[in-house]
């Protein structure tokens, strides 16, 4: 499947109100959700400590409070720069940014800007993508993922915080984005209702039924709270989620423990994956722009890479995702998307020519925008 | 320090059974993962079980699949393989493992204990 | 037969370097999954040296790496010592097979 090229507008359906958030990659791993290292002998596994490997690993400093209060990032976790690129080490060091973090909600009160002023931003995500304005930029080569097939153990952490469904993943996921390298440190889904769709991103306008984002840290960075709000500093791959006539095998050992963690703060553990299944198969062909996490804080300076191509659920499978998580207050989990962003002047770019495809609604071709890595 | 303890092996005739134990301590036991892995007489390593920290998740070489059955007591920090129908073949030093939280190697081994299947 | 192919032995003069293949297929390293190094001296258990392609748990010497590339991976030990002396064994995952090891390889020190 391909993205609809200038499709006539659909309602956005989705209950999301201007500032409406889903769990935003800005789920930024909290320290337990951040990988540590691994665990070859030589620290020496108190017990209750983790095992970590690694000559550089420092001993794990835990913040002194773990309480739903602070910051969130909950879910990008905060894994320490590697000197060696499979080793992060341990991520001790989470800022924690306020209390009123962890309190903001999809729709309805308190304002975004006011749980994070970086809401109010001029360069926030998501945005609509409209195929025939990217800016086609050859320098855009195919994407490379190192590390995202893994066996059955270590087991990973699947939970429910409240705001979307989030696996974290281990230590050495490594994309190369350009001429960076980018480490993989959770992913998690949006969704809407029955018969509402719930992706972040739209295409002309179109929204569809799901979307995932693979959340990851810049290299250049050695914890998430560093990379926050610096250019470049997060990246998240996002790809969207459509109906079709079978299961997906991939997502189905995700989806199918979903009731274990029906709860809002449960979790899982489930056995590891090729998480380069869940994502589309052409890496070749996708967007990208700099925008911001979809959630409170609202970050910016995060690389968005968005697929062309989509990821097909069977229709059980969706209603799966959208009608088995409950969130705050007695509350499903449903509609956990943040409205579109005005671009402000943003120009997304495009590995493939997208706007130069025909389509319907245009008779010549048009390409308006010019690549900015293009040039030399 | 982590230490993994090995103990159940000895001699036994082909078709017997024994249950090899293994036990841990100096770290989570229940948080990590948890192998067997044998070694005949002059012969290299071949893997044989593993489980999940929880024990919900069990997984067996085809050589002794229905044959072999790997569970955990994680309030007593013990690893167990259980070896049935043995044969000649299943003659090896067997070591527990432990694998790592994040990492699919093994991070920390027993010093093995010795199952001789003879007539 | 191994599912990883390893060579048997290799040798090398004290202060050399050797290096060690272990080539998979497209079902294991080629896969993607990582590899994982032990170290087996004569009468003891297996100790892990290298694990996730290329990282050393804590006490291994640096003069122990490992590299991967498309189906095959790589030990390399330079500043080749007395003590290094030993079976040499490569680990990954394997799509049908579950885990695997490589046959092991024997390094030996000439004198």
């Known amino acids: 499947q391909r993205l609809p090229r200038m499709q006539e507008d659909s309602p956005l359906g989705g209950g999301s109100s201007g500032e409406d958030d889903p769990l935003g990659e800005e789920d930024l791993p909290s320290e337990e959700d951040s990988p540590r290292e691994e665990d070859p002998p030589g620290e020496e596994d108190l017990p209750g400590e983790e095992d970590l490997p690694g000559e550089e690993d420092l001993p794990e400093v835990k913040p002194k409070s773990e309480e739903e209060g602070s910051l969130k990032l909950e879910d990008l976790p905060t894994v320490e720069a590697p000197g060696d690129p499979q080793e992060p080490q341990n991520n001790a060091h989470r800022d924690k940014e306020g209390d009123d973090q962890s309190h903001w909600r999809y729709g309805g009160d308190p304002p975004w800007p006011r749980v994070s002023p970086a809401c109010a931003g001029r360069f926030q995500s998501p945005v609509d993508i409209r195929p025939q304005l990217a800016a086609f930029c050859p320098a855009l080569r195919p994407l490379e993922l190192l590390g995202f097939q893994l066996p059955p153990l270590p087991e990973l952490r699947l939970r429910n915080n409240g705001h979307s469904v989030q696996l974290t993943l281990p230590p050495g996921l490594e994309m190369a984005l350009g001429p960076g390298r980018e480490y993989a440190l959770q992913l998690h889904l949006h969704w809407g209702a029955a018969g509402r769709p719930g992706s972040e991103h739209t295409v002309e306008g179109h929204r569809f039924p799901a979307e995932i984002h693979v959340v990851h840290l810049s290299t250049a960075f050695a914890r998430v709270d560093e990379a926050l709000g610096r250019p470049g500093g997060l990246a998240v791959l996002a790809a969207f989620l459509e109906e079709g006539p079978e299961e997906n095998s991939a997502y189905e050992q995700l989806l199918s423990r979903l009731e274990e963690i029906a709860e809002e703060g449960s979790e899982t553990q489930v056995p590891g994956l090729d998480i380069s299944a869940l994502l589309p198969s052409d890496f070749s062909r996708y967007f990208q722009y700099e925008g911001s996490l979809t959630t409170p804080p609202c970050a910016q300076g995060v690389i968005w890479t968005v697929f062309n191509q989509t990821v097909m659920l069977s229709a059980k499978q969706l209603h799966t995702l959208s009608d088995t998580l409950w969130g705050p207050g007695d509350s499903r989990l449903q509609l956990n998307f943040r409205a579109t962003q005005p671009l402000n002047g943003r120009v997304i770019e495009a590995s493939f020519p997208a706007g130069v495809d025909s389509s319907p609604r245009a008779a010549e071709p048009v390409q308006l925008n010019s690549c900015l890595a293009a040039g030399d | 320090q982590v230490q993994l303890q090995e103990s159940g092996g000895g001699l036994v005739q082909p078709g017997g059974s024994l249950r090899l134990s293994c036990a841990a301590s100096g770290f989570t036991f229940s948080s990590y993962a948890m192998s067997w892995v044998r070694q005949a007489p002059g012969k290299g390593l071949e893997w044989v079980s593993a489980i999940s920290g929880s024990g919900g998740s069990t997984y067996y070489a085809d050589s002794v699949k229905g044959r072999f059955t790997i569970s955990r007591d994680n309030s007593k920090n013990t690893l167990y393989l259980q070896m049935n129908s043995l044969r000649a073949e299943d003659t090896a030093v067997y070591y527990c493992a432990k694998i790592g939280r994040y990492s699919s190697s093994l991070g920390y081994w027993g010093q093995g204990t010795l199952v001789t299947v003879s007539s | 037969q191994s599912v990883l192919t390893q060579p048997p032995s290799v040798s090398g003069a004290p202060g050399q370097r050797v290096t060690i293949s272990c080539t998979g297929s497209?079902?294991?390293?080629?896969?993607?999954?990582?590899v994982h190094w032990y170290q087996q001296l004569p009468g003891t258990a297996p100790k892990l040296l290298i694990y996730d392609n290329t990282n050393r748990p804590s006490g291994v010497p640096a003069r122990f790496s490992g590299s991967k590339s498309a189906t095959s991976a790589s030990l390399a030990i330079t500043g080749l010592q007395a003590d290094d002396e030993a079976d040499y064994y490569c680990?990954?995952?394997?799509?049908?097979?579950?885990?695997?090891f490589g046959g092991g390889t024997k390094l030996t020190l000439l004198r």
């Open positions: 497209s079902s294991n390293i080629g896969r993607g999954y990582n």
């Open positions: 680990q990954s995952y394997d799509s049908g097979l579950r885990w695997v």
